[in-house]
Interface confidence: low
């Protein structure tokens, strides 16, 4: 007998009855590997309360239709004196991933499951070349489900400072390059779930083989291996492999992008902090409200419910969509359908379809996104039941008394997408969450400018246009409210920009939207400030311009206008530079992504060294070469001499390897005289070169001793970028 759903055959699946503390293991094509359930059990029930096992479905006694799979047993059950046998029934529905079997209910005799999976679809449009189970239950039978992260087309770009390679991954399944418009992925070999793009070549560095694993609480691991036997030449004889560790964040925050933490010998280690790695109970609700202690979230959408026969209407070109939230659409031609979303053809209003039913509802909050899903609608030609996905966005100034209205954004294979701006979707202020921007592979991070708490101070903008008598102080914070300290003590609590003068303080805008890359710079817009007349509110734009090495310059007020409704600041800062780490030899470094090239060899002293004096010590340092000063060791790049007794320490061996990252050039000297600590840590020196166009060669300044490293700061014109 041929297996009814071959895609699901390679794995043993799990489902849970949380109410009764029961774990089911399911193998639809063979038998589960649990001795206690016997040699032919297809569905094995493990009762954790009584610590007992029962086979509730025998692989030999299987019967199947296109959408239903039944496993009988030889065990009788007592159901009102009938001679029934214990059995399991799995109803299959078309889904967009392999999905997960969900426990529905159990009677004395029958254990019911439902499974939304690509394996049940009439057409192959959602089917992957290779896909593995993408969920796991922890010891407390809580489900961790990464299915929402699976991309049906395209891939995730892994964040890595290496500009020469791009690693693209999908979660639990191969990358569908055919449906992806991006040209970079088209060269990826079929079946790959981890595709490494080097120049114009793409390599398969991993395919899914095993399902998701739980390594410890809130830490999930997915491993990909390269199936092809041939070695890749850049892997030094090693077979490529990819390990993705999904980490549940300790507090609510927007999801990060996957980050490459190691890549030696083609063993790619990726860490991805995402709320999808957390157990699902906190993040999903079958009702219209949702709260999660861990995520620090409390949401209630019930005020959006319409009653008295009215619905929200959304225009979808050929169709009109009638929607209600937290209840049925009470439109006459939709009645009896129990539809939360009702699709009506404009040209023929008798053609009515339920695009999701109100009792099939999931409210999901994860990674900063609030989504309401209505599934179980009328079937379409592929066999997939219509469903609607409403993505809510926080908008405190939404119309319709803050309720806003849903907007149809598109349809993909019988799934209808809407966005809905409403104040009821606002989840506490997103601070520290959206403090960067991306532009393709280029990443920008403004978090270095964020001032969190005292003793830090707000940034104060420079305004050259004012006289001392009319002096206005402009206090700014980045991606955060201004700190209520000093002259900003009286600033409105939620202001991210605040103006203070003799008359008091004013909110010039709140941090509501994340920074954007625009015309080569980063734009940060703060809106919803104090009223400025005519029903308008003050808005502030900050243009952040890349200035390598400078994280200290203040913002400058450029203009203010529109009757005090608009302020514009400009800020030259290293935080606006593209994040990319580049290493160079021979005292030069070239950052191809930012287009900067640097040559610090003019700073190398052929004889002698640069001297930096402090109270107790004299420091002698050279750039990309050894210091030639008595009594310093001849191969040291930096050395420390005690003024009292001329005792000398080597602070690191000289080298000429510069690194450039985040607008700063650094030179590391390592392997100096060991400390007298337990581990005998060798002393090391870090010199950070910063751009000052007027400094010429400049000179080193001693900063501080930190973790066995001596830090020097050096302002010099040679650290200023020049176009190659």
């Amino acid at each position: 007998q041929a297996a009814p759903f071959p895609e699901l055959c390679s794995y043993t699946w799990e489902a849970v009855d949380t109410k009764n503390n029961v774990l089911y293991k399911i193998n639809i094509c063979g038998s589960v590997d649990i001795v206690q359930c016997g040699p032919s059990s297809a569905v094995c029930m493990h009762d954790l309360k009584t610590r007992t096992y029962h086979s509730v479905g025998d692989s030999v006694l299987r019967s199947a239709t296109r959408s239903l799979l039944e496993f009988n047993t030889t065990v009788s059950c007592d159901q009102q004196g009938t001679n029934h046998r214990v059995q399991s029934s799995i109803a299959f529905l078309c889904g967009k991933t392999l999905g997960t079997p969900e426990f529905v209910t159990a009677t004395e005799c029958v254990h019911y499951f439902e499974w939304r999976t690509t394996a049940a679809c009439k057409k192959d449009i959602f089917k992957a070349n290779k896909e593995v189970p993408c969920y796991v239950f922890d010891e407390e039978l809580r489900k961790h489900d990464l299915n929402p992260l699976i991309k049906l087309s395209g891939a995730y770009l892994v964040d890595d400072s290496d500009p020469d390679t791009s690693l693209f991954i999908n979660v639990c399944r191969d990358i569908d390059t055919l449906r992806d418009p991006g040209s970079q992925l088209r060269a990826c070999p079929p079946g790959t779930a981890a595709c490494l793009v080097r120049g114009h070549q793409a390599f398969d560095v991993g395919q899914p083989r095993d399902g998701l694993k739980l390594v410890r609480k809130d830490r999930l691991v997915l491993s990909y291996v390269r199936e092809e036997a041939g070695k890749l030449d850049f892997c030094d004889g090693h077979s490529p492999a990819v390990t993705i560790t999904f980490v549940c964040p300790s507090e609510r925050r927007e999801g990060t992008i996957p980050k490459l933490t190691a890549k030696s010998n083609c063993r790619y280690e990726i860490e991805w902090i995402t709320e999808y790695a957390c157990h699902r109970d906190y993040l999903e609700s079958k009702t219209c409200s949702l709260s999660g202690e861990q995520q620090d979230v409390s949401i209630d959408l019930t005020p959006l419910a319409q009653s008295g026969g009215s619905s929200y209407i959304s225009d979808g070109k050929e169709y009109l969509f009638y929607l209600n939230v937290c209840g049925e659409t009470e439109i006459q031609f939709c009645n009896k359908k129990q539809a939360a979303v009702c699709q009506v053809k404009k040209s023929d209003t008798s053609q009515v379809k339920a695009a999701g039913r109100y009792h099939n509802q999931t409210l999901r909050y994860s990674d900063g996104d609030l989504t309401l899903i209505y599934f179980g609608g009328d079937e379409c030609s592929s066999g997939f039941q219509r469903m609607s996905v409403i993505n809510f966005e926080c908008n405190k100034t939404a119309g319709n008394d803050g309720k806003g209205t849903p907007v149809f954004t598109g349809e993909v294979d019988c799934t209808y997408f809407f966005t809905w701006d409403t104040e009821y979707a606002c989840v506490k202020e997103k601070e520290d969450l959206l403090c960067g921007a991306t532009d393709g592979k280029k990443r920008y991070d403004l978090s270095a400018l964020v001032r969190h708490a005292e003793p830090e101070q707000n940034w104060e903008a420079v305004d050259g246009s004012q006289t001392e008598t009319e002096k206005k102080h402009f206090f700014i914070n980045i991606c955060h409210r201004v700190l209520q300290e000093g002259k900003a003590r009286g600033c409105p609590e939620d202001a991210a920009v605040c103006a203070v003068d003799k008359n008091g303080s004013k909110n010039l805008g709140k941090f509501i939207s994340s920074p954007m890359k625009e015309k080569g710079n980063i734009q940060l817009s703060y809106s919803d400030g104090d009223d400025c007349g005519h029903g308008k509110k003050i808005k502030t734009n900050i243009t952040l311009v890349c200035k390598p090495g400078d994280l200290e310059s203040a913002p400058v007020l450029r203009t203010s206008g529109e009757g005090g409704c608009f302020y514009e600041f400009e800020w030259h800062t290293a935080a606006a530079c593209v994040l990319s780490k580049t290493e160079g030899e021979n005292c030069t470094v070239f950052d191809s992504q930012a287009g900067f090239s640097f040559d610090l060899s003019p700073l190398t002293k052929k004889n002698g060294a640069y001297k930096v004096e402090t109270k107790k010590y004299d420091f002698y340092i050279n750039v990309c070469g050894p210091v030639s000063v008595s009594p310093c060791q001849p191969d040291s790049g930096a050395c420390q001499v005690a003024k009292s007794d001329e005792k000398t320490w080597n602070l690191g061996l000289s080298n000429a390897k510069l690194s450039y990252y985040d607008g700063m050039i650094q030179l590391n000297y390592r392997g100096g005289t060991p400390y007298n600590n337990e581990r005998h840590t060798p002393r090391a020196t870090l010199i950070t070169f910063l751009c000052d166009r007027d400094a010429g060669v400049g000179f080193p300044e001693y900063q501080e001793e930190d973790n066995s490293t001596y830090n020097f700061r050096w302002y010099t014109s040679y650290a200023c970028p020049e176009e190659p």
Epitope: T177, S183, R186, A187, C188, P189, P190, G199, F590
Partner: antibody, heavy 117, light 106 residues
Framework: QVQLQQPGAELVKPGASVKLSCKAS????????MHWVKQRPGQGLEWIGM????????NYNEKFKSKATLTVDKSSSTAYMQLSSLTSEDSAVYYC??????????WGQGTTLTVSS | ENVLTQSPAIMSASLGEKVTMSCRAS?????MYWYQQKSDASPKLWIY???NLAPGVPARFSGSGSGNSYSLTISSMEGEDAATYYC?????????FGGGTKLEIK
């Protein structure tokens, strides 16, 4: 093992067109870019362009954009380069080359194209 | 386009002699690749990623450099090393080659 087979020679009249072939074997044809390189007698090498058999994506050297057209036939694992409006300047050896974890790890034997009346 | 200039264009060396040839790029490149070509034969990849020897290349060959300046060195010339060597950059399209250095036996 990886092999790129090219015909040894082609003789064509000025003004005509020619379609050079490169048959690949020993690897999955759709996994790698195929490059084409020109070498005039006694001269250096010039990169013409490349094509990816999986999607047909191409990238040309601007200098050869109006001269060369790259195509593939996945079913026969063959890459083609059509050269049009031929002149004596086009007389050269044309190589196809395939990456090997790095550029141009494998080369065809080259096709000697002679443009002569 | 990034122009690669190889020098010298022709050089001769005695057996056992150390040989160095250079390749300068008009714009900085990430890596340099070198190919060996003997008469009437296809080029062969010789050095990749600036300093890695392709399979089968004798250990007497080495490559170095960064930015705009790269070189190929033979520590001790042998008869089979007589050939033309081309450098090539793969940093930016079009992927240019140098004009070649022809190495002959003295």
């Amino acid at each position: 093992q990886v092999q790129l087979q090219q015909p040894g020679a082609e003789l064509v009249k000025p003004g005509a067109s020619v379609k050079l072939s490169c048959k690949a074997s020993g690897y999955t044809f759709t996994n790698y870019w195929m490059h084409w390189v020109k070498q005039r007698p006694g001269q250096g090498l010039e990169w013409i362009g490349m094509i990816h058999p999986n999607s047909g994506s191409t990238n040309y050297n601007e200098k050869f954009k109006s001269k060369a057209t790259l195509t593939v036939d996945k079913s026969s694992s063959t890459a083609y380069m059509q050269l049009s409006s031929l002149t004596s300047e086009d007389s050269a050896v044309y190589y196809c080359a395939r990456p090997h974890g790095y550029p141009f790890g494998y080369w065809g034997q080259g096709t000697t194209l002679t443009v002569s009346s | 386009e990034n122009v690669l200039t190889q020098s010298p264009a022709i050089m001769s060396a005695s057996l056992g002699e150390k040989v160095t040839m250079s390749c300068r790029a008009s714009s900085s490149v990430n890596y340099m690749y070198w190919y060996q070509q003997k008469s009437d034969a296809s080029p062969k990849l010789w050095i990749y990623y600036t300093s890695n020897l392709a399979p089968g290349v004798p250990a007497r060959f080495s490559g170095s450099g960064s930015g705009n300046s790269y070189s190929l060195t033979i520590s001790s010339m042998e008869g089979e090393d007589a050939a033309t060597y081309y450098c090539q950059q793969f940093t930016s399209s079009p992927y240019t080659f140098g004009g070649g250095t022809k190495l002959e036996i003295k």
